[in-house]
Structures are given as structure tokens and as C-alpha cells.
Amino acid sequence: ECVTQLLKDTCFEGGDITTVFTPSAKYCQVVCTYHPRCLLFTFTAESPSEDPTRWFTCVLKDSVTETLPRVNRTAAISGYSFKQCSHQISACNKDIYVDLDMKGINYNSSVAKSAQECQERCTDDVHCHFFTYATRQFPSLEHRNICLLKHTQTGTPTRITKLDKVVSGFSLKSCALSNLACIRDIFPNTVFADSNIDSVMAPDAFVCGRICTHHPGCLFFTFFSQEWPKESQRNLCLLKTSESGLPSTRIKKSKALSGFSLQSCRHSIPVFCHSSFYHDTDFLGEELDIVAAKSHEACQKLCTNAVRCQFFTYTPAQASCNEGKGKCYLKLSSNGSPTKILHGRGGISGYTLRLCKMDNECTTKIKPRIVGGTASVRGEWPWQVTLHTTSPTQRHLCGGSIIGNQWILTAAHCFYGVESPKILRVYSGILNQSEIKEDTSFFGVQEIIIHDQYKMAESGYDIALLKLETTVNYTDSQRPICLPSKGDRNVIYTDCWVTGWGYRKLRDKIQNTLQKAKIPLVTNEECQKRYRGHKITHKMICAGYREGGKDACKGDSGGPLSCKHNEVWHLVGITSWGEGCAQRERPGVYTNVVEYVDWILEKTQAV
């Protein structure tokens, strides 16, 4: 069961796995949640009654019964991991801790104007986990305004002490705020020859890459496939680092694959969610339970519902045995990965889906695209919303996209003449406008946030956020789309679609059924040639066919230009403006969302 509140002056007895240092109980709970085995924790706050060496200790705990005896202890704060909860979880921690020195390896020291600048430096440094900044009031003159970038093996401080006039905080890489490049390249037949910081067993290079991405010290990896000549190293995933942050040497070896941590784009890829099944593969580990199950899918469900289960192996039933049910072996290990992987024994293995909630909801696979035709089907574009105005009468005003459970991203020009958010209604999960009746549920708009540099669509900054009055419960028909990653600026999107209920030609009316069109992106140079009277800036992106014929049009404004990359949909553009609709050599112009990621995160993550 999910218990979110913290228990003051309470200590859980026994069950210790490991002790780390965290600046707060809240962050201790996050660390516990991300630890493969932690279910409960006890944090010790600073207190005159406590030994200062125990201040800020975060003891991670496990228990077969999922609970432990409670003991009263002043300054102790205890609680449960969020593994038991169904809500979305994030490791993003923007808090700044005043008068705390978080200890680690100080590998970089430089002058910074502010703690914010120091945090940005940490976020954009490949090695940095956290920082300490000496303010201008710091007693020692030569240390004032010094920004110390730090890292540790675990990503958490090795100790935390009180120190006047300093502030500390964490890298914001997990908040999607890093400008570091996202290196998606995978190199077949390649070994990276740098130092190993850890090794785990993985069924394929993609799982290995995801493990590397959420490992605090891993910058790149080498994976030995099941055909690797040395039997003892088959399925071995080597997690690696180097001083420069890139591999210093790569060596060609058949049946090995190498790649990089995707830390700087982890908000738009699944990292914790290993959803594939591995056939004729057995995962070895500590056995938690053996249960009868009808299929490997059922076995995965059982594992997902058992909070301590990390992975499973299903052995299908022998003919007519046990009512056709096979054996489902629920398993766990110290690091969440199998201790060994065996092939050729007929088992089907996989991982718990419990950790999928640690990934951004937007990375969830949606139903396959319907090929051909222009009308969409239900659930095809679950992030698409229709924004209605109720004044003077109710009508469709613009499109928009769900990007968070309380946030819609749309175009600023939609709100020309809109005096108040009170007249706006957001409908999600809608296919046909005719579904919208008096009693159809909608989301009220609490706030309209228009980019403060917006003047008119053609001059850019045509972007706005709607904060909803209530939160969206994600379902198959209403869920968010991922924002593009700042580290992915060099990605070329080839599978892009524009959707909306807008006109199908210049003089037309709003369509009843949500329309879709696949449209190729056009380079800004090419686009500029087509719009000589306008300035096509890097904050705009264009899409269209040279011959015309398919385009967004009136009423599509604010809606998404959605592009699929590596099985994940990204909100690449917001329908903004164009000359006419679907005219020859007149591509549609969209707001280039990647250029506004910082602005979006600043507005949506504001405390």
C-alpha cells in the first residue's frame, strides 16, 4: 500500500541495506525509491540531541513483510519508498540547501556569480552530481564565490556537514535541464576500453544502455552479447567512465556493442522500464516466490504487483499439466539485475513494470499509427486537446497538447481577444467535435501563460501554456507527449504528423473528426527562401511538401507537430502560421519547441 507521509520522531528498526547521506528526509525518500531494494528508510535530521556525525544519514531498509517495527527517536524521520505508489515519480531536486556542505570528490573549482550559476555549471558538466557554493559572505576571502563541482560513486554525498555561508544543491540533469549532448549512437562490434565502474548482467544492449543511463557514475557502456566467445562474459554489461567524459579508446571486437548514457535526454526515453520479453532465456537471482501463471504476460503482472519482485522467469506448462498453467518464478537481486542469464532452457524472462512510473509518462507506447486516410481514430493522438471558448458562443478555438498532468502547450496567438481564462474549456480524449455536449466533462483553465516576448505569430515566440484547474488522469485516450530533448538538437525527425480539427482548405469550416497529415520537415534555409518577407528564426521550424497539398490550416493553430523518434513521440512544433494553406512552396511554420524547453520547464516546474 502507498504511504507518502513522513513519520516524525520515528525510527524503523532493522532491515538495513545501506546508509547514504541526504540533505533532507524528502530526498532520502527519493533515494530509497530509486534504490533497487529499498522499501523503507530512516533519516536523521540535525538536532542538538543527536551526534552530529549521524546528522543527515539516510538508512535504506528492506523487509520481507514490507514493514518494520517502529521505535520512537527524536530527530529521526522515517517513511516508505514510492515504489508502492502508482503516481509518477521524479528524481528532479531543485532545492538549494543553505549552510550545508555536501561532501564528495571536488574535481572542479571555479568562480561563479551566484548559486544558480553554480548549479547550471553542475547541470552542464558530465561528471557533476552536486555542488557547494561559498557565498560572498563566506568568512575566507579566497573562497568567496567559489563553485565546487562534486561527484561520488553513488551520486549522493559521502557526508554532509553544517557550514555557515555556503549553499549546496544537486545537478538538474534529472529535471531535463542539461545542455549536454544526448549521444544516441550505438557502435556494433566495439569495445570501449576505459575504466569499469560497475558491471551487471543484461539481456541486450538496450537494457544495458538504460542501466547505464540511471547509474550515477556511468557515462558509456560496453555490452557482450550472448554470442561473445568468452562464456563467462556473455550478457555482461560493463558500466564505464573516463576523465574526458568520452571513451578514450575504442577497440573492434565481434559480438560486443557499445554506447552512451542517455542521462541528458532521459526525460524523453524509457530508462527504468524494460518492457520486452526475452524468449528462451532464464534470469537467475534470489527466488521470492513461485506461482502458477497462464502466460508470460500474466507472470509479468504478478511480478509487477509484488513490490519486491524485480524480474521473473516463466516456464511454460508441459502439455495438459496444471490446467495449462506454467511456473512463474518471481526473483530479485541486490542491484535489480539478474545474477546470471542463461539461454536455451525454454524459459521466458522479463522485468517488473513497477519502475515504469519512474519514467516520464510520455514515453509509454501508444497504439500503432493507422496508415493511410486523413481521419484519425480514437487514441491515436492522445495528447491532442481541443480548446474551446464559451464567448460569445461555445466553439473550437485552437488545438493544444498535454505535456503534463496540469499543463497544455499551445500557441500564444490563440488568445488574441481572450480577456480571461474563465471562458476557456479544454477537452481531452476527443475524436469528434460532435461528442462535446453540455454535460461533457472538461478542464477549466486556471492560468494562461503567454511568452513575454510574443507580439505576433510571424515574429516568433508564439507559445503559451495553460495551467488547468484540475489534473488530468492519464488513460489510453489522454496522455502527455514528450518534449524534445535539448541534447537532441542534431536529431533529424523523419516521421512527423500535424493534427487538428482545422479547415481542410482556406475557405472551409472546422472539421468534426480529428484530421492527420504526415508532413516532412523543411530546413530553415529552404523555408527562408519561401518566405522572403519574413525572418525565419532558429526558434521556428517548417514543414510541408514542395508541391503543397498537405498542411495545417485555420483552427489547427496551437496543435502539435508530433514526430516519432526511437519509438517515442516528441512535440517538435506548435502550429503557428503560414501563407495560405497547403500552397505550393509555402511550408507551414511552427514554433520550434526544443528552443523553448527551458521556458516551459521554468514555468511548469515553478514552486
Epitope: P188, K252, L257, N490, I492
Partner: antibody, heavy 125, light 108 residues
């Protein structure tokens, strides 16, 4: 048809800078690793630098490390080599070349299967 | 760094001759070796990749063999257009990607 066209070479004084470009066409540029290789007059081939498809992973010969920067713009199908602090020994014909394969299928070779015609860089006072 | 030693550095031959060039690596490079041809004033052209695979469009008179440290490149019957400089290149360990010193094949 695959084509690579280098430009940006010329005469420059020692200590000066040049930026070479290589415009690619006829293939999906963003799927391929790219390389710069140079050849001093009357001499053999010398590898200079390489860059991965996404542009995030780069490598350099010791002789140019810290002075040259390889980059790419996948939206423009263009590879670049920014050359700073040029020396007389950097005088050469500079070729851009494409690595043969970039997929996860069985046959994966890093042979350089297409080369540009080269651009001449002369460093002299 | 892996050194590639090519021999001979030059050779003279006649049309129709069989020509053999060798390349030796300073350490084991498995089969990760390529062969290129460069005609005067032109860019290099790939002939053989991964020690023995003939590049598409390259005549079958060109062949390669070997693995580990010793490699051989052969032209079974020299054509007039084959007078050029030939280079071997390893890509087993990077950086650097290294080329042999080249073998110039000219007319006897």
C-alpha cells in the same frame, strides 16, 4: 548518388584559423559517422578526426588535439572542421570521408567508402 | 598506437603481371583492415574492407587476405588503370585510425 564536397581551404598564416566544410548529398547523412583525413604534398594519408552520427562522440589525432574541432549539422547535411593555431605542418589536402556502415545488422565495417575531392590548406607566412 | 608497415614502398610492374603488397600491424588487429587505391591528383577509393571483402563495383582482380598482424593485397592481372598508390588502413583500435605508408605501383 553519394557526393561529398569540401570547401573552405586556402592560404593562411601560421597561428591563423580556417573552417572547412563538407556538404553531403545522396544518402541519409544523420545515419553515418564521418571522418577528416589529410595528405601532405607528396606524402601518405593521415587520419585527422572522426565524429559519430549524432555528433556527440568525437575523436582526434594527437597532432591536432586541442587545435581542431570537428562538428556536424545534420539538418544541413554538413560536416565541419574548425582549425585554429595552424602550423606549417598542417599544410595538406583535406578530405572528408564517410564510414561504410552505421547500422546494427551483421556486417558492420568502418571502411571509408566515399571520399570528397579534397580542399587544399596551405599554412605559410 | 598501432603502426602499419606496408611493403614494398614502391614496385614496378607490367600490364598483366600479378602484384602482391603486404601490410603488417604492430599488434593483432583481427580482420579490421581496409585497402585503398589512390590515383594521382584524386581522392582515395575503397577496394577491400575487413581484410578480404571486395567493395561493390570493384573489379574481381583485386583481392585481400590475412588476419591478426599479417595481411596481403593482390592484383591478379595488372590493368593500365591500376598504376596508382595503394594504402592499407586499420580500424581495430581508435584513436588513431592509422594508414600504412603506401605502395606506389608504376610501369616497368
Amino acid at each position: 548518388e553519394v557526393q561529398l564536397l569540401e570547401s573552405g581551404g586556402g592560404l593562411v598564416q601560421p597561428g591563423g584559423s580556417l573552417r572547412l566544410s563538407c556538404a553531403a548529398s545522396g544518402f541519409t547523412f544523420s545515419h553515418y559517422s564521418m571522418q577528416w583525413v589529410r595528405q601532405a604534398p607528396g606524402k601518405g594519408l593521415e587520419w585527422v578526426s572522426s565524429i559519430s552520427p549524432s555528433g556527440g562522440y568525437t575523436m582526434y589525432a594527437d597532432s591536432v588535439k586541442g587545435r581542431f574541432t570537428i562538428s556536424r549539422d545534420n539538418s544541413k547535411n554538413t560536416l565541419y572542421l574548425q582549425m585554429n593555431s595552424l602550423r606549417a605542418e598542417d599544410t595538406a589536402m583535406y578530405y572528408c570521408a564517410r564510414e561504410k556502415a552505421s547500422d546494427l545488422s551483421g556486417t558492420y565495417s568502418e571502411a571509408l567508402d566515399y571520399w570528397g575531392q579534397g580542399t587544399l590548406v596551405t599554412v605559410s607566412s | 598506437d598501432i603502426q602499419m608497415t606496408q611493403s614494398p614502398s614502391s614496385l614496378s610492374a607490367s600490364v598483366g603481371d600479378r602484384v602482391t603488397i603486404t601490410c603488417q600491424a604492430s599488434q593483432d588487429i583481427d580482420y579490421y583492415l581496409n585497402w585503398y587505391q589512390q590515383q594521382p591528383g584524386k581522392a582515395p577509393q575503397l577496394l577491400i574492407y575487413d581484410a578480404s571483402n571486395l567493395e561493390t563495383g570493384v573489379p574481381s582482380r583485386f583481392s585481400g587476405s590475412g588476419s591478426g598482424t599479417d595481411f596481403t593485397f593482390t592484383i591478379s592481372s595488372l590493368h593500365p588503370e591500376d598504376f596508382a598508390t595503394y594504402y592499407c588502413q586499420q580500424y581495430h583500435t581508435l584513436p588513431p585510425l592509422t594508414f600504412g605508408g603506401g605502395t606506389k605501383v608504376d610501369i616497368k
